[in-house]
Interface confidence: low
């Protein structure tokens, strides 16, 4: 399907002008290639009428032009002094007329209505309000005032000053007669319907002295605004319906093949399941305006959308509406990224979020979509630091890998973390994307102790176990803070051949803090990555307490000189809080690493990554 998009139908009246906007993917080639407007003939050929290279056909000379806006990926064709002969089928396109990079446009030019002399024309959108002004002479001031609608040769009474109201106008029409001295009465019609369209006659008095005034009421369906967005991107519909419906329920609906309108979302809590996790209705301003954001755009989201107001939260005739025609461009600049990321309870996920690479300095955000009522998306984390307290120690936003992608890591997963999350920036809003996190059955691949209490001034060593499948990955420990996770200095992992034949159930990377200080308290993450692409993480909280003087019991670590393949019976013993703690779930069937605690020089915090059979008695 062609990625060029424009209005399907354009209608106007003889003598008027039209402006036709066509959209194209703003690639470098497209921006500079020829743009054209051509008319389809009986033979099927499309004859150029105007092009971006300066050509204008004789038929269009002096009344048409084509302007390219390469930075927006649009071009506009203006045609003035329209005649009935201009009605027909056209194409706006790129390149060669016959190439297919085009969009079909139907132009209909109709004859203006024949109106009686002195007719006042009122042009109003459907659902809005019109005030028809009816002048009269002094002698008719005390006499009956009325408004009629002309239907063919007959006149049907709509309203009069004797309290008659035509049933078709019940509850939406009023006749106002001013005080003395003002020689004009007005008829106000609210919530205009398409059927209200037509010629009206104001009348004051009767007989030959009566005052009459013709009014032509043109009720228009709103012209849909064309919206051209990229596949996987985001669209925002801004809906401003006016103060008169500020307190009425609002909705966005999509026109279906039966020409009815299916509610997509409304302020009464209804939401189409096809938009679950990727739609928000932003709360309305005082003036009643609101906006609807849809992310993760799909080709099937294309179509005509209407926003409106009605107490039922759905489209009803005679209520104000706004319209859009959405086209989803499949030649998207937004890269593919997983829309579903799976993690296990207790494990972690690393989510890749795309952003406009031209906006590398923009602030990056991650929010949790909440479906309640109109939906909301409270920020959980941003590139300048953590936002939500309850995510402390388990959420981080990283600028890596960069160049149009950032990473969000969430660990200590529970079933409550399942849901939809949005990636966004304070820059280009079209790059908002949605990812669903699913919690599946399984065990975390990385295993760390539950809670660790370190003692001031002593050495602390925390093991992190990982399976063989991660042997080729880079392992790291980092200290979490609300501005990121600061990688701790890593030690040499040893010869690469150590990772070639991985027949162990698991390996470990250990963190050593020596000596422990008050500043060491906090969350630490063990993780794996490949280059700038992050994998799984596991978190552990380290509490720091004063050294106990009396009555403390020391449990020595497992013997360091155990033979390489010898399983140590008491493999659940860990040196934490100077107490023996059994944790068979974590350490059973795994070889124990001994750590004498004293570091031979090196940095105070260090990471040691090695297979268990290669580790010696002291930390490297």
């Amino acid at each position: 399907k062609s990625p060029v998009f424009g209005p399907q139908e354009v209608s106007s009246v003889e003598g008027n002008s039209v402006s036709i906007k066509c959209y194209y993917p703003p690639t470098s080639v497209n921006r500079h290639t020829r743009k054209y407007w051509c008319r389809k003939g009986a033979s099927g050929r499309c004859i150029t009428l105007v092009s971006s290279e300066g050509y204008v056909s004789s038929n269009y000379a002096g009344r048409a032009n084509l302007t390219n806006f390469p930075e927006n990926g649009t071009f506009v064709v203006n045609i003035a002094q329209l005649s009935r002969d201009d009605s027909g089928h056209y194409k706006c396109g790129l390149g060669i007329n016959s190439r297919g990079l085009s969009f079909d446009v139907s132009l209909e030019v109709s004859q203006g209505p024949e109106l009686p002399n002195g007719t006042e024309v009122y042009t109003v959108d459907v659902g809005r309000t019109v005030t028809i002004k009816c002048p009269f002479k002094t002698e008719n001031a005390p006499k009956t005032k009325a408004l009629y609608k002309k239907i063919g040769q007959t006149s049907v009474l709509v309203i009069d000053s004797r309290n008659y109201v035509n049933p078709n106008y019940k509850d939406r029409i009023r006749l106002r007669i001013p005080g003395t001295g003002q020689l004009i009465f007005t008829v106000v019609i609210d919530r205009l319907r398409l059927s209200d369209h037509g010629l009206y006659l104001c009348q004051a008095g009767d007989g030959s002295n009566r005052d009459e005034k013709n009014a032509d009421l043109q009720v228009l369906e709103p012209e849909p605004e064309l919206v051209y967005e990229d596949l996987r991107g985001s669209v925002t519909f801004h809906c401003a319906l006016g103060l008169e419906v500020a307190n009425v329920a609002k909705f966005l609906c999509r026109v279906n093949s039966r020409e009815t309108c299916d509610v997509v979302i409304n302020t009464l809590g209804k939401r189409d399941s096809a938009f679950e996790g990727r739609i928000l209705l932003n709360p309305q301003d005082k003036d009643g305006s609101f906006s609807v954001v849809i992310t993760g755009l799909r080709k099937e989201d294309e179509g005509r959308y209407l926003c409106g107001a009605h107490s039922d939260g759905q489209l009803q005739e005679g209520w104000p509406i706004q319209a859009w025609q959405l086209f989803v461009n499949e030649e998207s600049t937004i890269p593919r990224s997983p829309t579903v990321v799976k993690g296990v309870a207790g494990g972690s996920v690393a989510v890749l979020c795309p952003y406009n690479p031209k906006e590398s300095q923009s602030l990056k955000y991650w929010c949790l979509w909440e479906g309640a009522q109109n939906g909301r998306c409270p920020l959980l984390v941003e590139s300048q630091g953590l936002v939500q307290e309850q995510y402390e120690g388990r959420l981080s936003l990283l600028q890596e890998p960069g160049n149009g992608t950032f990473t969000v890591i969430l660990n200590q997963l529970t079933t409550q973390d399942a849901g939809f999350y949005w990636c966004l920036t304070n820059g280009d809003t079209r790059w908002r994307t949605t990812v669903e996190i699913k919690i599946i059955e399984g065990e975390p691949n990385l295993k760390v102790p539950g809670n660790v209490t370190a003692v001031l001034g002593e050495t602390l060593n925390i093991p992190c176990h990982f399976p063989c499948k991660f042997s080729s990955y880079e392992k790291y420990w980092c200290k979490w803070s609300n501005t990121g996770c600061q990688t701790l200095p890593s030690q040499d992992e040893g010869p690469s051949e150590a990772f070639v034949n991985c027949d162990e159930n698991s390996r470990l990377v250990s963190l050593t803090l020596n000596p422990v200080t008050r500043a060491d308290e906090g969350w630490y993450w063990c993780g794996v990555k490949q280059g700038h692409f992050y994998g799984e993480t596991a978190a552990v909280y380290v509490a720091v307490e004063e050294k106990k003087v009396a009555g403390s019991r020391y449990v020595s670590p497992a013997k360091a000189d155990a033979a390489p393949d010898e399983k140590v019976l008491d493999s659940g013993v860990r040196e934490i809080e100077n107490k023996a703690i059994q944790d068979p779930r974590l350490f059973a069937e795994e070889k124990v690493v001994a750590d004498t605690g004293d570091q031979a020089g090196g940095s105070r915090a260090s990471v040691d990554s090695s297979s268990s059979e290669e580790q010696g008695g002291s930390s490297k």
Epitope: G269, G371, A372, E389, Q390, Q416
Partner: nanobody, 125 residues
Framework: QVQLVESGGGLVQAGDSLRLSCAAS??????????MAWFRQAPGKEREFVAS????????YYADSVKGRFTVTRDNGKDTVTLRMNSLKPDDTAVYYC????????????????WGQGTLVTVSS
């Protein structure tokens, strides 16, 4: 449709304690997406705000008249919210209502969208 059912009301002496519970059921969305609050209405008076709690229990807010005496908590696992009332006074006599909302704000103007039927608390002197 959402149902909120209060329990735990009764007749107590001034200075005593009482614990009110509110159980939620029939929600389209899980309990932990709703902010919750307690209100009360004394005979012949308007309904007044007592206390509220955010959907995750992270923040609470109390009316000045109950601050330091009442504590609101929630158990999202059991879909319940509790109001612990200590040092009760005769002025605390009222029908106590549980309410839910789709967002929380501090202050006494809690944006309630569903209400319970109420439970009567009578404090005698």
């Amino acid at each position: 449709q959402v149902q909120l059912v209060e329990s735990g009301g009764g007749l107590v002496q001034a200075g005593d304690s009482l614990r009110l519970s509110c159980a939620a059921s029939g929600r389209a969305l899980s309990f932990n997406t709703y902010a919750m609050a307690w209100f009360r209405q004394a005979p012949g008076k308007e309904r007044e705000f007592v206390a509220s709690i955010t959907y995750n229990g992270g923040s609470t807010y109390y009316a000045d008249s109950v601050k330091g005496r009442f504590t609101v908590t929630r158990d999202n696992g059991k879909d319940t919210v509790t109001l612990r009332m200590n040092s009760l006074k005769p002025d605390d006599t009222a029908v106590y209502y549980c309410a839910s909302a789709q967002y929380w704000r501090s202050g006494t103007s809690f944006p309630a969208n569903y209400w319970g039927q109420g439970t009567l608390v009578t404090v005698s002197s």
